[in-house]
Interface confidence: medium
């Protein structure tokens, strides 16, 4: 059923290549609605009737919500931001985060995707991520591929670069994590690695690109030399326990 | 190191076609994106088309969508660009870029030239 | 075309910082922490010199430094040298559909 779905939760924005270099392979974020079960490190947490979560930043709030200051006027004043629930479309927005999963902030308003450009929305992805042994029903992202996934990309568990529906498809030390528009095996991070933070149920909806979850023995950090002046720019990176 | 050749680049005339290759070494080219970045004389620089490691999916500017197609060969580390029905404002220096989340790497580019 | 926009020129003397803007909307730039800034000397390629905002490559000078606030992104160049001496492109995406999107560029120009 919809909601015993599993989902990889652990968001990147652009994993260090593993050659060394700037920049590097990315794919963009599966979140999952209150009630689904997601993938927190190798436990799996339920996330029904939570309480309003404080935050710093949209990333650490649910693909329904986005971090913002309870009462009306600047974000943060008066103390503690909290996630809040997503606009609906049509509604008044300042950022994509503050829209609702298949829409996006233009102009000041809350717009539907153009899914004819756009990859699937955060519920059809976890439809897609529950279709079991059908991996030609789920080669689509919203865009038509010019070849179809086969079962037989499943026989051996994906290296690094394959196209992957769960982090199951990937060899040891990968995590499945979007790119662009498809879903690829990536390196699970190492002490050190630039990471993403996502204290609960992974990343808002208009994440593009993914990182995988830090490696054991590791937690995604603030990187306590690093002050940025924006919060949506500190850096957090893998670091020991 | 990492390093990207671009070849294939001439003049050519409206309406005619040109293949463009890029020659990738020093990392694992069938784990990358990559993509295609133009620049024409004196201007700024357009992304063009990207391709998926796998080949399973490629996409492009609206600018060339139809007339253009990206392929790799993952096997000789190669990386394509099918040029068709080529128009004067399609006069640019073509460039291969490792595409991450940014275009980490690129080559050295290849002039394309559409004269009559 | 959609493109970020940039001054078309900036200039600044040996030492000096100087900072490049980058303005984009809502649905690209303003969007996104997926800003890159690129240097292009004339007649060579494009080098990566800032990812993910305020990211630096390795090998690239502590004197490049990015920041972003709200529908702008920024380069500053501190202590400014002859070599600096380049155009500049931003990048990020648009939302619908996804693609990657540049600045015009701005030239830099280091004076004396």
């Known amino acids: 059923t919809l909601n015993s779905v599993l989902i990889n939760s652990n968001a990147i924005k652009n994993l260090p290549p593993p050659l060394g270099g700037a920049g590097g392979q990315p794919g963009s974020a599966v979140s999952v609605a209150p009630g689904v079960l997601y993938e927190g490190g190798n436990k799996y947490q339920t996330l029904d009737n939570y309480q309003p979560y404080p935050c710093a930043e949209d990333e650490e709030c649910g693909s329904d919500e986005y971090c913002s200051s309870p009462s009306r006027g600047a974000a943060g004043v008066g103390g503690v931001q909290i996630c809040l629930a997503c606009r609906k479309r049509r509604k008044r927005c300042m950022r994509h985060a503050m829209c609702c999963p298949g829409n996006y902030c233009k102009n000041g308003i809350c717009m539907p995707s153009d899914h004819s450009h756009f990859p699937r929305g955060e519920i059809e992805e976890s439809i897609i991520e529950n279709l079991g042994n059908d991996h030609n029903a789920a080669a689509g992202d919203g865009y038509p591929r010019r070849t179809t996934l086969t079962s037989k990309i499943y026989h051996t568990k994906g290296q690094e670069g394959s196209v992957c529906l769960r982090s199951s498809d990937c060899a040891a030390g990968l995590c499945c994590a979007r790119h662009f528009w498809s879903k690829i095996c990536k390196p699970v991070l190492k002490e050190g690695q630039v990471c993403t933070k996502h204290k609960r149920k992974g990343s808002h909806g208009l994440e593009i690109f993914q990182r995988c979850y830090c490696g054991e023995g590791l937690a995604c950090r603030i990187q306590k030399d690093h002050h940025q002046a924006s919060n949506s720019s500190r850096l957090h990176t893998c670091q020991r326990h | 190191q990492v390093q990207l050749v671009e070849s294939g680049g001439g003049l050519v005339q409206p309406g005619g076609s040109l293949r463009l290759s890029c020659a990738a070494s020093g990392f694992t080219f069938s784990s990358y994106w990559m993509s295609w970045v133009r620049q024409a004389p004196g201007k700024g620089l357009e992304w063009v088309s990207v391709?998926?490691?796998?080949?399973?999916?490629?996409y492009y500017a609206d600018s060339v969508k139809g007339r253009f197609t990206i392929s790799r060969d993952n096997s000789k580390n190669t990386l394509y660009l099918q040029m068709n029905s080529l128009r004067a404002e399609d006069t640019a220096v073509y460039y291969c870029a490792r595409h991450g989340i940014d275009f980490d790497h690129w080559g050295q580019g290849t002039l394309v030239t559409v004269s009559s | 075309d959609i493109a970020l926009t940039q001054p078309a020129s900036v200039s600044g003397s040996p030492g000096q910082s100087i900072t490049i803007s980058c303005t984009g909307t809502s649905s690209d730039l303003g969007g996104y922490n997926y800003v890159s800034w690129y240097q292009q000397h004339p007649g060579k390629a494009p080098k990566l010199m800032i990812y993910d905002v305020n990211n630096r490559p390795s090998g690239v000078s502590n004197r490049f430094s990015g920041s972003k606030s709200g529908n702008t992104a920024s380069l500053t160049i501190s202590g400014l040298q002859a070599e600096d001496e380049a155009d500049y492109y931003c990048q990020s995406y648009t939302y619908t559909p996804i693609s990657p999107v540049f600045g015009g560029g701005t030239k830099l120009t280091v004076l004396g």
């Open positions: 391709i998926s490691s796998d080949s399973s999916s490629t």
